[in-house]
């Protein structure tokens, strides 16, 4: 891939318009399909000015450690509902879409550099913990990967793509 | 003690332009944002815009963007929010406050513009 | 652009609990911040993140956000809660919001 393919906004746009649309189809997040298990996902909430005044190699930790446990969630997520009897055709679509989408963001990431950032020297503090939530529908795991995508992540591709600019 | 204070009262016509400070004290004027805050009589909060001293970054609310305009001086710890030509609709209170991850914690006192004819 | 709603008003009789809420679009996916406000004065901040205080806020003020909806909850009322109160959140964008504010009125 390009290394600054992921700068181009349309590119994550395409994205979390996916990850939008599977929320959409599950029905709202209160009566949607439910699942079996609850989910620890990436808590998304964002205080901005906190966001913006973290250094770029904090927000890539904090980046990786989302993508990471939302991939394991969604393939979770994937497994619970081949478990399940007559699973709806399109919400297997949609994880698999999403599934398709977090490789897709993982390497365009990895070409921009971003694993650079995760080599701390011994020294450095430990980054704190990834805040976490749980999920129980799979309407709020798609929202958890659309606000991932709209919050964190395009804010530190923003950060990573502007630097690289300058 | 964080303090921000602001310039003082402001009586001007339609068309006129103007330029109002805050200044920061107490604090490192470059380690947090400024923001503006509009409260039109008896009316609530609307929030204008932001601006980051150290980076100069600024960020408009959509409904100020190309109405006012926000700039900073951090050589004298002093943001500024300006009008080129003035309305009646821009009598408000405009509140200057330090945002941090604790957003808008330290407020100033506030400048009351009136623009009448 | 995000829009928060807010009652106009609410009254409370002194030593009960106030609740007063502010609903936005998926609001709870967002962090939510209370401002209190007396006539003639500037804004205090009262909640950030939710539910936290700022240090010299009484730990009669709580927050908490889920869903549509996030909640300021004044516990044993005093007449100098009366107040305008305002919610606001960050939008992923950058944008500050303030929903159009409540006025608390302390009943007696």
């Known amino acids: 891939a390009p290394p600054r393919l992921i700068c181009d906004s349309r590119v994550l746009e395409r994205y979390i318009l996916e990850a939008k649309e599977a929320e959409n189809v599950t029905m709202g997040c209160a009566e949607g399909p439910r699942l079996s298990e609850n989910i620890t996902v990436p808590d998304t909430k964002v205080n901005f000015y906190a966001w913006k005044r973290m250094e770029v190699e904090e927000q890539a930790i904090e980046v990786w450690q989302g993508l990471s446990l939302l991939s394991e969630a969604i393939l979770q997520a994937q497994a619970l509902l081949a478990n399940s009897s007559q699973p709806p055709e399109t919400l297997q679509l949609h994880i698999d879409k999403a599934i398709s989408g977090l490789r897709s963001l993982t390497s365009l990431l990895r070409v921009l550099g971003a694993q650079k950032e995760l080599m701390s020297p011994p020294d450095t503090t430990p980054p704190a913990p990834l805040r976490t939530l749980t999920v129980d529908t799979f309407c709020k795991l798609f929202r958890v990967y659309a606000n991932f995508l709209r919050g964190k992540l395009k804010l530190y591709t923003g950060e990573v793509c502007r630097r690289g600019d300058r | 003690e964080v303090q921000l204070v602001q310039s003082g009262a402001e009586v001007k016509k339609p068309g006129e332009s103007l330029k109002i400070s805050c200044k920061g004290s107490?604090?490192?004027?470059?380690?947090?944002?400024i923001g503006w805050v509009r409260q039109m009589p008896g009316k609530g909060l609307e929030w204008m815009g932001w601006?980051?001293?150290?980076?100069?970054?600024?960020r408009y609310s959509p409904s100020f963007q190309g109405q006012v305009t926000i700039s900073a001086d951090k050589s004298i710890s002093t943001a500024y929010l300006q009008w080129s030509s003035l309305k009646a609709s821009d009598t408000a209170m405009y509140y200057c406050a330090r945002v941090s991850s604790e957003p808008f914690d330290s407020w100033g006192q506030g400048t009351l513009v009136t623009v009448s004819s | 652009s995000y829009v928060l709603t807010q009652p106009p008003s609410v009254s409370v009789a002194p030593g009960k609990t106030a609740r007063i809420t502010c609903s936005g679009d998926?609001?709870?996916?967002?962090?939510a911040y209370w401002y209190q406000q007396k006539p003639g004065q500037a804004p205090v901040l009262v909640i950030y993140d939710d539910s936290k205080r700022p240090s010299g806020i009484p730990e009669r003020f709580s927050g908490s956000n889920s869903g549509n909806t996030a909640t300021l909850t004044i516990s044993r009322v005093e007449a100098g809660d009366e107040a305008d109160y305002y919610c606001a959140t960050w939008t992923f964008e950058g944008d500050y919001v303030f929903g159009g504010g409540t006025k608390l009125t302390v009943l007696g």
């Open positions: 998926k609001l709870g996916d967002h962090y």
């Open positions: 601006i980051d001293p150290y980076r100069s970054e600024i």
């Open positions: 107490g604090y490192s004027f470059t380690s947090y944002w």
